[in-house]
């Protein structure tokens, strides 16, 4: 139970995550005009990742986008590569961790498909998350950067006689979106890896056979599982409650494969 | 099509208040500020400043910080200026005028005559 | 605040001709964001409301005659009538419409023949 509850959980935060993500992407607000300590202009500068804009007093906002491909800033091509391989990973992690989440049956789905699925999922939710971290960390470091250099040369003029003022930007609302939703998607894929864990068989029925040189006798195992006789695995056993009992007879136990995991 | 009608001329003694209104009709009355602009007789424009007509946030120039106010009533579609403790250089034509592109003023009211006189 | 100087403050020409009248601001009123100047241009005859003709230094406002025309950017503007008409005798305002608060200039006056 805890463990389909922490694989949907971490499903479900994904999920709230990478719409952030793709929220963050779109926003325009990446960077918005400084207001602080700056002439009051009835004109406000934003900018995105795909377009920039501008809101007049007058309540008219005009937007341009960036139609050139080769003139834009390394920097900034390389935040929306960022951005966009975080939405791409997410998606596809979302629709993989769709088919392994537990309250959903697939035909005959065994655990350990959807516990790899699970895993699976949870990997890309967190190379995800981390591209959008990155992404909007490596904008918001450029930003800083040209900030101070702006603030340096806050007033260029032309012999002190003409004042052209420049404008410096700070960081906008998508930053702040960006960063919790890439820390989301995060938690929900560590979410999953956990899930992961539990969704995996720990123990085969192997564990309730015990194996002698001599002879072909059976060991039960007090509220395991069923007896199962000789080195035939019965793999539609279910187990029902291991009370963790070992009789002395108990020799050897074969791991299982996801032990390890 | 867009209008701004303005009340008529008003005669006041100095110390009196006056409120002056704006009638908009024509467009969506929160979706765009309202400025006033004052014109003494023969002399040149004044920007007196603009009222956010959707959130009623107002904006004054520095002159006219004070005794001016600035309000609007949106059932009404209607701004108004209100001036406190008027004074002889109170004398003027107010012009309301809505804001657009660029921040430029495409419509204007007629203007009212405000005459302070003793 | 932001200083708006008109010159010349008086323009005489007969009708035909073609007239330009300057408009400079204390500081520069080009917006970085959209590359656009927030300077208007206004004509006011006797006893009327300003009318607008110019927005953004250049952009002629819907029903203008194609005979103004603004340009200039920073803080330097320029209205030019290509062919000055009888009906154009007016007094000519520029506006700051960059900063707070939006001054005008103190206007130019063109007298026709």
């Known amino acids: 139970m805890a463990v389909t509850a922490c694989q949907g959980l971490g499903f479900v935060v994904s999920l709230i995550g990478i719409a952030g993500i793709i929220a963050a992407t779109c926003m325009d607000q990446w960077s918005t005009q400084d207001l602080y300590n700056n002439p009051v202009t009835a004109v406000f500068n934003y900018q995105g990742l795909w377009r920039s804009c501008v809101r007049e007093s007058s309540g008219f906002t005009e937007c341009r986008g960036y139609f050139t491909l080769l003139g834009l800033p390394a920097m900034l091509q390389a935040v929306r590569a960022l951005m966009i391989v975080g939405i791409v990973l997410g998606a596809i992690g979302l629709l993989v961790s769709i088919f392994a989440l537990k309250c959903i049956r697939i035909g005959s789905m065994e655990d350990s498909a959807k516990a790899n699925m699970t895993l699976t999922s949870g990997i890309m939710f967190i190379v995800s998350g981390l591209c959008a971290i990155a992404g909007v960390s490596v904008f918001a470091n450029m930003l800083v950067t040209n900030f101070w250099m702006s603030t340096a040369n806050m007033y260029t003029g032309m012999g002190g006689m003409v004042q052209t003022v420049q404008t410096r930007y700070t960081f906008g609302a998508a930053l702040f979106v960006g960063w919790v939703a890439g820390g989301l998607t995060l938690i929900g894929g560590v979410m999953m890896c956990i899930a992961c864990r539990g969704l995996a068989p720990e123990e085969t029925n192997y564990k309730a056979v015990s194996y002698h040189a001599s002879g072909h006798s059976v060991a039960y195992k007090p509220g395991g599982f069923k007896a199962s006789t000789g080195f035939g695995s019965n793999t539609k056993n279910k187990k029902i409650y291991d009370g963790g009992a070992r009789t002395e007879d108990e020799v050897q136990s074969y791991p299982s494969k996801h032990d390890y995991v | 099509q867009i209008q701004l009608v303005q009340s008529g001329p008003e005669l006041k003694k100095p110390g009196e208040t006056v409120k002056i209104s704006c009638k908009a009709s024509?467009?969506?009355?929160?979706?765009?500020?309202m400025n006033w602009v004052k014109q003494a007789p023969g002399k040149g424009l004044k920007w007196m400043g603009w009222?956010?007509?959707?959130?009623?946030?107002?904006t004054y120039a520095d002159d006219f910080k004070g005794r001016f106010a600035f309000s609007s009533e949106t059932s009404a579609r209607t701004a108004y200026l209100q001036i406190n403790n008027l004074k002889n250089e109170g004398m003027a034509t107010y012009f309301c005028?809505?804001?657009?592109?660029?921040?430029?003023?495409?419509?204007w009211g007629q203007g009212t005559l405000v005459t302070v006189s003793s | 605040d932001i200083v708006m100087t008109q010159y010349p403050s008086f323009l005489t020409v007969t009708t035909g001709e073609k007239v330009t009248m300057s408009c400079k601001s204390s500081?520069?009123?080009?917006?970085?964001?959209?590359?656009?100047?927030?300077l208007t241009w206004y004509q006011q005859k006797p006893g009327q409301p300003p009318k607008l003709l110019i927005y953004?230094?250049?952009t002629r406002e819907s029903g203008v005659p194609d005979r103004f025309a603004g340009s200039g950017s920073g803080t330097d503007f320029t209205l030019t009538i290509s062919s000055v008409q009888a009906e154009d005798l007016a007094i000519y305002y520029c506006?700051?419409?960059?900063?707070?608060?939006?001054?005008f200039g103190s206007g130019t006056k063109l007298e026709v023949k």
């Open positions: 005028a809505r804001s657009y592109n660029g921040n430029s003023l495409p419509y």
């Open positions: 024509g467009y969506t009355f929160t979706n765009y500020g």
């Open positions: 009222i956010n007509t959707y959130t009623g946030e107002s």
């Open positions: 500081q520069s009123l080009l917006n970085s964001g959209n590359q656009r100047n927030y």
């Open positions: 953004w230094a250049s």
């Open positions: 506006q700051n419409n960059y900063f707070y608060p939006f001054t």
